[in-house]
C-alpha cells in the first residue's frame, strides 16, 4: 500500500472547461476565425458564439494552430474529450486528429504520446459526439495545447474538456541515471520509457515518467497491467555493476518549499532473479537550485523480511524537514535496484513561493498562483461530480458519449 | 556572483594530452552539470561531454576514446582531459554550465572565458 | 546525431534592420533550442533557451519561435552592438549539437 499515493483510476474529473470554473482569461489561442469562434468558445458542450473554437488558419499542412487552457497550477491529466462546431446543430466542423502539447512551466513544452510514440490522437468524425481519450501515460501538465490536423485544406473547429486532478505532491522533476535492461532468457528493458524530460546520455533529467505516473508494478517485474508492453515496463531499473559508489542518487524538485514527512518507495524484491529492496537510503535537503545541501543528511536503514518475493512499498521518514530539492542516494542490497513508483507525503510551507530568493533568473510567469491555505475535497473530488469511468482493456481506448 | 575559470596550457605537442582545470564559484555543483565544448575555424562548436553534479559522465562518440572527464566537488574544480591530440584539435577550449531543475533550467548560462589550444611541435 | 542546419552563414545589415536567422533540426527536438551570441575574442552569451524564452537582461528586440524541426531567431531593430556571430543549439538529446553560425555585418 503507497500512503498518500495517488489513485490515477480516481484522478478522472472535469477540470472545469464544460462548468465554466476554468474562466475565458485561462482559454486562449493561437488565432480565430472571428470573435464568434474565439478561444473562449472552445468549451465542450457549450452552444456560445458559433459553437466551438476555429483557427483563422489552415491547420493543413502546417499544424501550427492550438487552442490552450491554462489550468493555473499543476495537475494530472487523465483524459481529454473533443467535439466539433455546434452552430445551432447545424456546424460541420470537426477535427478528425489532433496532437497535444503540454507544459508545467509555459517555457518548455513537450509533445504527449503514447506508449509506443504514437502523438496523433484520433479525433471526431462529426460535429457533435463528444470523443474522450484516455490518455496512457498520463500527463503533470500546467498548460496544455490542442493541436488539430487535418489531411487536406478544410475547416476545423473544436470544443475540449480536460479531465484529472490536482497534483498534490507537486513534483516537478526527478532526476534519474538511464534505467538499464536485464538479460533473462528474454531481454527485460527497465528504461523509465515515459520520461518526458531530457536524456542526454546516461542521465535523465528535467522531467517526469513511470515513477511518478500512480501504477505500481506487479510481484513479477517482466509482468504488467498494461496491455501490449514489454517486458519489465512498469520497473525503472539499475544494476549494480554500473555503479562503483555501490547506490543510486536521484534528485527530486518540487513546485514549491514543503514540509517531507515520508518517502514512498514501491520497489520489487524478486530476489531469485536478482531484484532485491534497497539496503537503506540517505536523503539530502535543500531549498533553492543553487543552494548547498542543509543540515545532516537523514539515514534509514532498511531491515525486514527479505526473502518475501512480493513487491511492496518502503516508506523512508524524512522528519518534516523543509526543502524543495531532495537528493536520495539508494543503497543496493543484491544485483539490481527496481522501483515502480516513487511518492511523497508533504505539506506546503505556508507562505512559500515557488521563486524563492533571487537565486535564479525569473521564468517569464513562473510560478504558478498560491496554493490555498487548504486543500478542501472540492479541488480533489468535485461536488456532485463522478469521475469518468476508465475504459476496460487499453488505457489509450477512444470512446463516444454521443 | 557564478564564474567559471578556466586554466590549462596554450601549447601542446602532436601526441600529447591536453588537460585544463574549470574552477566553479558562486553556486554549487549540485543540480548543474559542466559540459565541454570547442571551437575551431573549421568545425565551428563541437560539444564534446559533460559532468553531472553526481559525477555521471557522458561523452561525445566521435572523442569517447580519448576524453575523461572528472571532478572534485569539495574544491568546486571539474578536470578536462583529452589524449593523443593532433593539429586538427587546435582549438578553443569552454566549459560551460547547465541546470538539471526545471526553475533553474537556462540552457548553458554561464561559460569559461576559454582555453585557446594550439597542437604544434 | 542531430544535424543543425543553419541559414544564412553571412548577412549584411544596416542599423535598424529587421533580421531572421533560421535553424532546421534534421529531427524532432521539441521546442529543445538555445540561441547564443558571440563577439570577437568573447566565449558564447545565451540569449534564447526553449526556443522561445528570452534569458535574464536580454533586450526585447531578440526573438525566437518554433518547435520540432524549424526554428527561428530574429533581432526586430538591429543596432551596431549586435554585430556578431550568431548560433542555433539543440540539447534535446545527446550529443548536443550547435548549428554552423550566422556572422552579421555591416553593409
Known amino acids: 500500500d503507497m500512503k498518500g499515493h495517488f489513485d490515477p483510476a480516481k484522478c478522472r474529473y472535469a477540470l472545469g472547461m464544460q462548468d465554466r470554473t476554468i474562466p475565458d482569461s485561462d482559454i486562449s489561442a493561437s488565432s480565430s476565425w472571428s470573435d464568434s469562434t474565439a478561444a473562449r468558445h472552445s468549451r465542450l458542450e457549450s452552444s456560445d458564439g458559433d459553437g466551438a473554437w476555429c483557427p483563422a488558419g489552415s491547420v493543413f499542412p502546417k499544424e501550427e494552430e492550438y487552442l490552450q487552457v491554462d489550468l493555473q497550477r499543476l495537475h494530472l491529466v487523465a483524459l481529454v474529450g473533443t467535439q466539433g462546431r455546434h452552430a445551432g446543430g447545424l456546424g460541420k466542423e470537426f477535427s478528425r486528429s489532433y496532437r497535444l502539447r503540454y507544459s508545467r512551466d509555459g517555457r518548455r513544452w513537450m509533445g504527449w504520446k503514447d506508449r509506443w510514440g504514437q502523438e496523433v490522437i484520433s479525433g471526431n468524425e462529426d460535429p457533435e459526439g463528444v470523443v474522450l481519450k484516455d490518455l496512457g501515460p498520463p500527463m503533470v501538465a500546467r498548460l496544455v495545447r490542442f493541436y488539430p490536423r487535418a489531411d487536406r485544406v478544410m475547416s476545423v473547429c473544436l470544443r475540449v474538456e480536460l479531465y484529472g486532478c490536482l497534483w498534490r505532491d507537486g513534483l516537478l522533476s526527478y532526476t534519474a541515471p538511464v534505467g538499464q535492461t536485464m538479460y533473462l532468457s528474454e531481454a527485460v528493458y527497465l528504461n523509465d520509457s515515459t520520461y518526458d524530460g531530457h536524456t542526454v546520455g546516461g542521465l535523465q533529467y528535467g522531467g517526469l515518467g513511470q515513477l511518478a505516473d500512480g501504477v505500481v508494478g506487479l510481484d513479477d517485474f517482466r509482468k504488467s497491467q498494461e496491455l501490449r508492453v514489454w517486458p519489465g515496463y512498469d520497473y525503472v531499473g539499475w544494476s549494480n555493476h554500473s555503479f562503483s559508489s555501490g547506490y543510486v542518487e536521484m534528485e527530486f524538485e518540487f513546485d514549491r518549499l514543503r514540509a517531507f514527512q515520508a518517502m514512498q518507495v514501491h520497489c520489487n524484491n524478486m530476489h531469485t532473479l536478482g531484484a532485491r529492496l534497497p539496503g537503506g537510503v540517505e536523503c539530502r535537503f535543500r531549498r533553492g537550485p543553487a543552494m548547498a545541501w542543509e543540515g545532516e543528511p537523514m539515514r534509514h536503514n532498511l531491515g525486514g523480511n527479505l526473502g518475501d518475493p512480493r513487491a511492496r512499498a518502503v516508506s523512508v521518514p524524512l522528519g518534516g524537514r523543509v526543502a524543495r530539492f531532495l537528493q536520495c542516494r539508494f543503497l543496493f542490497a543484491g544485483p539490481w535496484l527496481l522501483f515502480s513508483e516513487i511518492s511523497f507525503i508533504s505539506d506546503v510551507v505556508n507562505n512559500s513561493s515557488p521563486a524563492l530568493g533571487g537565486t535564479f533568473p525569473p521564468a517569464p510567469w513562473w510560478p504558478p498562483g498560491p496554493p490555498p491555505t487548504n486543500f478542501s475535497s472540492l479541488e480533489l473530488e468535485p461536488r456532485g461530480q463522478q469521475p469518468v469511468a476508465k475504459a476496460e482493456g487499453s488505457p489509450t481506448i477512444e470512446f463516444r458519449m454521443d | 556572483q557564478v564564474q567559471l575559470k578556466q586554466s590549462g596550457p596554450g601549447l601542446v605537442q602532436p601526441s600529447q594530452s591536453l588537460s585544463i582545470t574549470c574552477t566553479v564559484s558562486?553556486?554549487?555543483?549540485?543540480?548543474?552539470?559542466i559540459h565541454w565544448v570547442r571551437q575551431s575555424p573549421g568545425k565551428g562548436l563541437e560539444w564534446l561531454g559533460v559532468?553531472?553534479?553526481?559525477?555521471?559522465?557522458d561523452y561525445n562518440a566521435a572523442f569517447i576514446s580519448r576524453l575523461s572527464i572528472s571532478m572534485d566537488s569539495s574544491k568546486g574544480q571539474v578536470f578536462f582531459k583529452m589524449n593523443s591530440l593532433q593539429a586538427n584539435d587546435t582549438a578553443i577550449y569552454y566549459c560551460?554550465?547547465?541546470?538539471?531543475?526545471?526553475?533553474?533550467?537556462?540552457?548553458?548560462?554561464?561559460w569559461g572565458q576559454g582555453t585557446s589550444v594550439t597542437v604544434s611541435s | 546525431s542531430i544535424v543543425m542546419t543553419q541559414t544564412p552563414k553571412f548577412l549584411l545589415v544596416s542599423a535598424g534592420d529587421r533580421v531572421t536567422i533560421t535553424c532546421k533540426a534534421s529531427q524532432s527536438v521539441s521546442n529543445d533550442v538555445a540561441w547564443y551570441q558571440q563577439k570577437p575574442g568573447q566565449s558564447p552569451k545565451l540569449l534564447i533557451y526553449?526556443?522561445?524564452n528570452r534569458y535574464t537582461g536580454v533586450p526585447d528586440r531578440f526573438t525566437g519561435s518554433g518547435y520540432g524541426t524549424d526554428f527561428t531567431f530574429t533581432i526586430n531593430t538591429v543596432q551596431a552592438e549586435d554585430l556578431a556571430v550568431y548560433f542555433c543549439q539543440q540539447d534535446y538529446t545527446s550529443p548536443l549539437t550547435f548549428g554552423a553560425g550566422t556572422k552579421l555585418e555591416l553593409k
Open positions: 526553449y526556443a522561445s
Open positions: 560551460a554550465r547547465r541546470s538539471t531543475t526545471v526553475v533553474a533550467d537556462y540552457a548553458m548560462d554561464y
Open positions: 559532468i553531472w553534479s553526481g559525477g555521471i559522465t
Open positions: 558562486g553556486f554549487s555543483f549540485t543540480g548543474y552539470g
